[in-house]
Structures are given as structure tokens and as C-alpha cells.
């Protein structure tokens, strides 16, 4: 009897190890999306960026969905969200329309159930990019911890999208689940 | 018999609690490395920073290795990587040769198996630090979620290293494992 | 007998699932605190910000305490700490006392046992906000991984608090526990 119980115990331990490992993995959605440079919109006002890579280079996604330019949450939880946005201008690109620029990023959450959009995080700077310098660069980083529900969507808006640095190490955003909701 | 089973169950629970706790700890490597100010290189172009503290002040490391100026991954996984780099100039610091500065950070990953280096994240700004002000300061923060394999190395490159703020709260980088690779 | 054992095993699995889930949640304190705009101090020097929301909008807290303007750690562990601070000025707000500004944030840790305060992270920039532009904006983001002990307190200090952007998406700080201390 005692031997049988030990065997069962071993099974409990074994199956638990698998279950714990598997459930841990499944409980941790993530995404790291990098800018798709072939499809950056123009304009200087606030524009939503809808083209991102999720399956090449540093881009990756698991247990979340990328659709219509939005990162869709599939699993309720508390997530750490982040974005890194780089802007740049070289004099060879032509003259800037204005030397006074507002370079901004807005990380927004949209709920489909209650059709509304809210800014979770914003960052940026006003810049004076004078003609005395042949090259200008500026990066913004934002990050924060948010409760997200299944079906909610995360999107990125920026000002002056034509100034975006198209490199995958420069302009990206992402999320990873840290814990469940009580 | 039933009593015996309950005792076994308690053992299962107990050993499991230990096992789960222990495996959770072992599954979570991390590092927070702060700049070693006694060994900051000179130069104006991209320079690799190789001197960091991992065992004093806020510096710490666990289940990762710091060697030859690089943070070495010992355990496959998805990690959140971050860096905070501060630059500063005071009129007493020395004769600044130019007001137009490119203050940049690059977080790079090197694979020894396939000897190649790739930039995971970059950030920074071009700055105009005029002599009309006696003090100048600027900080960069970058962060992102990346798949790292055992043996891969993370390093930090900056422009204008002699302008780095040598405080441990100013110039640092780090990583922590968030989840396993499926 | 064997049937009885299987029932016990199911109980082990069931209780374990609850226990693991519950202990995981309890092991993961977090906070995301947003600025309380009704109580921003004045001055241009380093000032501690003591008014934050923890229970409205994006503000939230769990297994940590907010008291006297400080975020109090209730559980030993390694935490990821972050802050996002936005400064802004519009010409309609009146003239700035000076065009040369030092816009800074300091994330500090205070230990009650050993009454001392240490800066964990700092960031910011010197800015020239000239009268040639009607609007100025600048954001700082810092983040890092730190060992925190129960009873320790996290607080935020900034320069030029009267220039703070009072939006919840602009000025906030937070923490979440990543792992236990060995």
C-alpha cells in the first residue's frame, strides 16, 4: 500500500511539474512589436501607427494578437507596457517645415465593449531642430503597469510620424503579463 | 491507511511548496549593473562600456555572469532589458569642444556561436549645450522584452563617454527573466 | 484503496492549483500611482511629491501601502521600479522665472530602521525654454530592478514641480514584485 502511495505521489509530483510549467507559460502573454518602415504615415499631427512587425527580427508575440494595427489582449491580467520611439532628421532629407517640433508618443487602450479610447501613458518633448546642425535625433521611452482585460486593444499614436526612425532597435512597443487579476 | 495517505499528501504539499519556491527562484536570473566611474573610456564615437559594478551599492547579479564588460546569459528565456544613461557637463569639468552633441546609448547582443553583434535597443538625443549655461544634463532610458539564449552577451555602447554621470543612480543597466521559452 | 488514493490525488491537485494560484498572487505586490494635481507643491528646487492617487483612474495598489506620500513595501523582494514625469509650460501660464531649467526626477528609498534616504534612480535634462515658442514639454522615464525590504519606502522628488503635467498618463510612478529574495 505504502509503495503504491509513493508511486502515486511521484505521479502527482511529475504531473504537477508539467502542469505548473505549462500553466506558467500559458499564463504569460507577451509582445514586442517593431515599426514597419514601409508603411509610416505622413503628417505632423497625432497619428496612429498601424504597421508593426510581430514575427521578424526582434518582433515577437505569444498569447496576444496583433490585428488592424492594434495589440489585442487575449488574457485578463496585469501587464507591463512599454514603448520606445525615436525621431530623426538629416539635412539631406530636405528642409523641415518648422524648426519647432512637438515629438510625442501616446500609448492608448481601447475597449470594444465600451467603445472608448484612453491614453495610458504619454511622453515626449518640444524640440528646436535648427538648421545649424546637419543631424537631429531624439528618443522617448515610456513604461507602466496596467490592468488589461481580454479584448482590450493597445495602440500607439505619435506626432510627426514622417520623422520616425525606422530601425527595429529604435521604434518599438511591447507588453508582458506580470500577474493575474485577483 | 487513510491517515497515512493524509500524511503523504502533507508531504507532497510541503515538498511541492519547497520545490515550487526553489524552482521559481532558480528560474529567475537578474542583474543590475552600475557604472564603474574609475574606468570610463574617452572618445567621441560609439564606445563600449566595459567597467560595471555588480556587487556593490545597487549593483547585483544572480544566475547571470558579468565578464569582460559583458552581461552573459546563463539561462534561456525571455528577459526584460533596460538601461539608464546620464550625461552631464559643468564648466569646471573641462574644455568642451562643441556645443552640438550626439548623446546616445546602444544595447547590443552578441552571440558567441555565430560571432555577430546586433543592437536590441537604442536611444538618445542630439543636444545643443551652449556656453551660456554653466551646467548641462541629459538622461536616456530604454527598455524592452527580448528572447535570450544561454551564452549570449549583453553590452552597452555610448557616444561621448567622458560626459557620463558616474553616479550609481544615474548610469546603469540591467535585466531580469520574465518567462521561459516555450 | 486505489480509488481512495486517486480521490486524494485529485484533492492534492485541486488544492495545489488554488494554493499555487493564491501564493503566486500574494507574492506579487504592485502599485501604479498617478499624480494628484490638486496638491502639487511650488518651488524650483528639489521637492518631494507626496500626493498621488492609488485608487482612481490608472492608479492601483496591492500588497503595498501608500502613506504620507510614500509607497511602503510590505513584502521583501526584488521589484522593478519605474517613474514617468512630464513637465510642460504654456505662455498663457505666465512668464517663466528663467529660460534655463533643470528638469529632474529622483526615485529615493528610505529605510525607517536606519533613518537614511538613498537615490535609486535619477533622470532628466537641462532645458532652454525660450520665449520664441508658446508651448514647451519634456518627459523623463526611469526604471530599474531593486531589492526592497518590508518597511522600506519609495518616494519621488522633482525639480520645478509647478511645471508638472497633472495628467494621469503623464506623471506617475510604480513598482511590481518580480521575485523573492533568496
Amino acid at each position: 500500500g505504502s509503495q503504491h502511495i509513493r508511486a502515486e505521489k511521484a505521479m502527482v509530483d511529475g504531473s504537477w511539474l508539467d502542469l505548473a510549467k505549462r500553466s506558467k507559460l500559458e499564463a504569460q502573454p507577451f509582445a514586442h512589436l517593431t515599426i514597419n518602415a514601409t508603411d509610416i504615415p505622413s503628417g505632423s499631427h497625432k497619428v496612429s501607427l498601424s504597421s508593426w512587425y510581430h514575427d521578424r527580427g526582434w518582433g515577437k508575440i505569444s498569447n496576444m494578437t496583433f490585428s488592424n494595427g492594434k495589440l489585442i489582449v487575449n488574457q485578463d491580467g496585469f501587464y507591463y507596457l512599454y514603448a520606445n520611439i525615436c525621431f530623426r532628421h538629416h539635412e539631406t532629407s530636405g528642409d523641415l517645415a518648422t524648426e519647432y517640433l512637438q515629438l510625442m508618443v501616446y500609448v492608448t487602450k481601447t475597449s470594444i465593449k465600451i467603445p472608448s479610447s484612453h491614453t495610458l501613458m504619454k511622453g515626449g518633448s518640444t524640440k528646436y531642430w535648427s538648421g545649424n546642425s546637419e543631424f537631429h535625433f531624439y528618443s522617448i521611452n515610456v513604461g507602466g503597469f496596467f490592468k488589461l482585460r481580454s479584448g482590450e486593444e493597445i495602440s500607439i499614436e505619435v506626432s510627426n510620424p514622417s520623422l520616425l526612425d525606422p530601425d527595429q532597435d529604435a521604434t518599438y512597443f511591447g507588453a508582458f503579463k506580470v500577474r493575474d487579476i485577483d | 491507511g487513510s491517515q497515512h495517505i493524509r500524511a503523504e499528501k502533507a508531504m507532497v504539499d510541503g515538498s511541492w511548496l519547497d520545490l515550487a519556491k526553489r524552482s521559481k527562484l532558480e528560474a529567475q536570473p537578474f542583474a543590475h549593473l552600475t557604472i564603474n566611474a574609475t574606468d570610463i573610456p574617452s572618445g567621441s564615437h560609439k564606445v563600449s562600456l566595459s567597467s560595471w559594478y555588480h556587487d556593490r551599492g545597487w549593483g547585483k547579479i544572480s544566475n547571470m555572469t558579468f565578464s569582460n564588460g559583458k552581461l552573459i546569459v546563463n539561462q534561456d528565456g525571455f528577459y526584460y532589458l533596460y538601461a539608464n544613461i546620464c550625461f552631464r557637463h559643468h564648466e569646471t569639468s573641462g574644455d568642451l569642444a562643441t556645443e552640438y552633441l550626439q548623446l546616445m546609448v546602444y544595447v547590443t547582443k552578441t552571440s558567441i556561436k555565430i560571432p555577430s553583434s546586433h543592437t536590441l535597443m537604442k536611444g538618445g538625443s542630439t543636444k545643443y549645450w551652449s556656453g551660456n549655461s554653466e551646467f548641462h544634463f541629459y538622461s536616456i532610458n530604454v527598455g524592452g522584452f527580448f528572447k535570450l539564449r544561454s551564452g549570449e552577451e549583453i553590452s552597452i555602447e555610448v557616444s561621448n563617454p567622458s560626459l557620463l554621470d558616474p553616479d550609481q543612480d544615474a548610469t546603469y543597466f540591467g535585466a531580469f527573466k520574465v518567462r521561459d521559452i516555450d | 484503496g486505489s480509488q481512495h488514493i486517486r480521490a486524494e490525488k485529485a484533492m492534492v491537485d485541486g488544492s495545489w492549483l488554488d494554493l499555487a494560484k493564491r501564493s503566486k498572487l500574494e507574492a506579487q505586490p504592485f502599485a501604479h500611482l498617478t499624480i494628484n494635481a490638486t496638491d502639487i507643491p511650488s518651488g524650483s528646487h528639489k521637492v518631494s511629491l507626496s500626493s498621488w492617487y492609488h485608487d482612481r483612474g490608472w492608479g492601483k495598489i496591492s500588497n503595498m501601502t501608500f502613506s504620507n506620500g510614500k509607497l511602503i513595501v510590505n513584502q521583501d523582494g526584488f521589484y522593478y521600479l519605474y517613474a514617468n514625469i512630464c513637465f510642460r509650460h504654456h505662455e498663457t501660464s505666465g512668464d517663466l522665472a528663467t529660460e534655463y531649467l533643470q528638469l529632474m526626477v529622483y526615485v529615493t528609498k528610505t529605510s525607517i530602521k536606519i533613518p537614511s534616504s538613498h537615490t535609486l534612480m535619477k533622470g532628466g535634462s537641462t532645458k532652454y525654454w525660450s520665449g520664441n515658442s508658446e508651448f514647451h514639454f519634456y518627459s523623463i522615464n526611469v526604471g530599474g530592478f531593486f531589492k526592497l525590504r518590508s518597511g522600506e519606502e519609495i518616494s519621488i522628488e522633482v525639480s520645478n514641480p509647478s511645471l508638472l503635467d497633472p495628467d494621469q498618463d503623464a506623471t506617475y510612478f510604480g513598482a511590481f514584485k518580480v521575485r523573492d529574495i533568496d
Epitope: 545649424n132 | 574617452s42 572618445g43 567621441s44 569639468s93 573641462g94 574644455d95 568642451l96 569642444a97 562643441t98 556645443e99 552640438y100 552633441l101 545643443y128 551652449s130 556656453g131 551660456n132 561621448n160 563617454p161 567622458s162 560626459l163 | -
Partner: antibody, heavy 122, light 107 residues
């Protein structure tokens, strides 16, 4: 061709003033810090003034501080040295020199002019 | 101010000889040393910077080494056109100071 050409040297009495000029060509002048270096007859080299690329920082050794003023006009690709309260020991060949790119706090010189002679004598 | 002491003040060597000049700084300058060549009646030319880096277009017979306070400049095989005075300069901290010079003559 990268070139620096000095002018404005001459004979001046002690206590007098002189303004040296340096015309730059063949490179983007506004991107470089510049300096004046002098060489007394039969002697070694002595750095006397430096100016940042944008002109808002100026630097001098104690020997000339308060008497010499370095300036630049980036629109004209020109560097200047205003020398007041001249002394006999200021007699030298004055070279205009371009600071090479490098660490922002370190100055060494990769392009030199041909020099202009300043003689301070009564 | 950092003093730079150069030695010898002059030397005479034959074509093909290896010539070595030393420069001593009064304090640690890490590797922030430049070397210049000044031919008679001409302006100085940059040869070496940051102790050991050859400037663009400088022949490989010219080299530099050292760190801290002691530095060496070497001409591996002296050529007739190397007749000149050679100066070291510290570019570590302002004011930028030069050594007294070493006059190299051809035997």
C-alpha cells in the same frame, strides 16, 4: 583642399593691440573647434586660445587670460584673435589650428595654418 | 598645469636608424598624448594622437606608445625627409601643453 590662412600680424608697441584673422576653407568650419597656438623665435609651441565649434565656449591659459579674446564667424568661415595689452613676450609666430574630432574634452590639432608673425617691440 | 618634459632635446642619427624620443608628463594623462612633426620653416603636422593612433596618411614607420606619465615616439627606420623637430602634447586637460621639442638631424 583643407586650408587655414592667417593674417593680421605685424609690429606693435608694448601695451598695443592687434587683431589676427584666420580664413578656413575645404571643410565644414562650423563643425570644428579651433585654436591659436604660438611659437616664440627658436622656442617650442604654446597654446594660447581655444573656441568651441559654435563659439559659445572660449578657453585660455593664464598667461593670456583677460588680454586675448578668441572669436569666430561661422557664416564667414573665419577665426579671430583680439590681442590687447601686448607684451614683448607675446612676440611669436601665431598659428591657427583646427582641433581634430575626438573626445569632447580633449584637444589636439590636425590642421595648421602657415602662421602670421607678431612682433611686440618699442 | 601639466608639464611635459621631452628628451633628448636633440639627436643625430643615420638613415635607416631606429630613433626613439621620450616624453614625461608631470601627472597621469592616461593615453592622451599627441606627437607632431615640424620641418624647418613650416607649420607643425599631426602624426600620432591618443598615444598610439597614427593620423591619416602618416607613414607606418612612425609609432607611439605609453600610458600614464611615460610615453615613447619611435621612427623605426629614419628617412632623409624626417629631418625635423618633434613635439609631444598632452590632450588630457586644459591648458594644452607641449614638450620642449626634440630636434632630429641626419648624420
Amino acid at each position: 583642399e583643407v586650408q587655414l590662412v592667417e593674417s593680421g600680424g605685424g609690429l606693435v608697441k608694448p601695451g598695443g593691440s592687434l587683431r589676427l584673422s584666420c580664413a578656413a576653407s575645404g571643410f565644414t568650419f562650423r563643425n570644428y573647434a579651433m585654436s591659436w597656438v604660438r611659437q616664440a623665435p627658436g622656442k617650442g609651441l604654446e597654446w594660447v586660445a581655444g573656441i568651441s565649434s559654435g563659439g559659445t565656449y572660449t578657453y585660455y591659459p593664464d598667461t593670456v587670460k583677460g588680454r586675448f579674446t578668441i572669436s569666430r564667424d561661422n557664416a564667414r568661415n573665419s577665426l579671430y584673435l583680439q590681442m590687447n595689452s601686448l607684451r614683448a613676450e607675446d612676440t611669436a609666430v601665431y598659428y591657427c589650428a583646427r582641433r581634430d574630432y575626438g573626445d569632447v574634452y580633449e584637444w589636439y590639432f590636425d590642421v595648421w595654418g602657415t602662421g602670421t608673425t607678431v612682433t611686440v617691440s618699442s | 598645469d601639466i608639464q611635459m618634459t621631452q628628451s633628448p632635446s636633440s639627436l643625430s642619427a643615420s638613415v635607416g636608424d631606429r630613433v626613439t624620443i621620450t616624453c614625461k608628463a608631470s601627472q597621469d594623462v592616461r593615453t592622451s598624448i599627441a606627437w607632431y612633426q615640424q620641418k624647418p620653416g613650416k607649420s607643425p603636422k599631426l602624426l600620432i594622437y591618443s598615444a598610439s593612433y597614427r593620423y591619416t596618411g602618416v607613414p607606418s614607420r612612425f609609432s607611439g606608445s605609453g600610458s600614464g606619465t611615460d610615453f615613447t615616439f619611435t621612427i623605426s627606420s629614419l628617412q632623409p625627409e624626417d629631418l625635423a623637430t618633434y613635439y609631444c602634447q598632452q590632450h588630457y586637460s586644459s591648458p594644452w601643453t607641449f614638450g620642449g621639442g626634440t630636434k632630429v638631424e641626419i648624420k
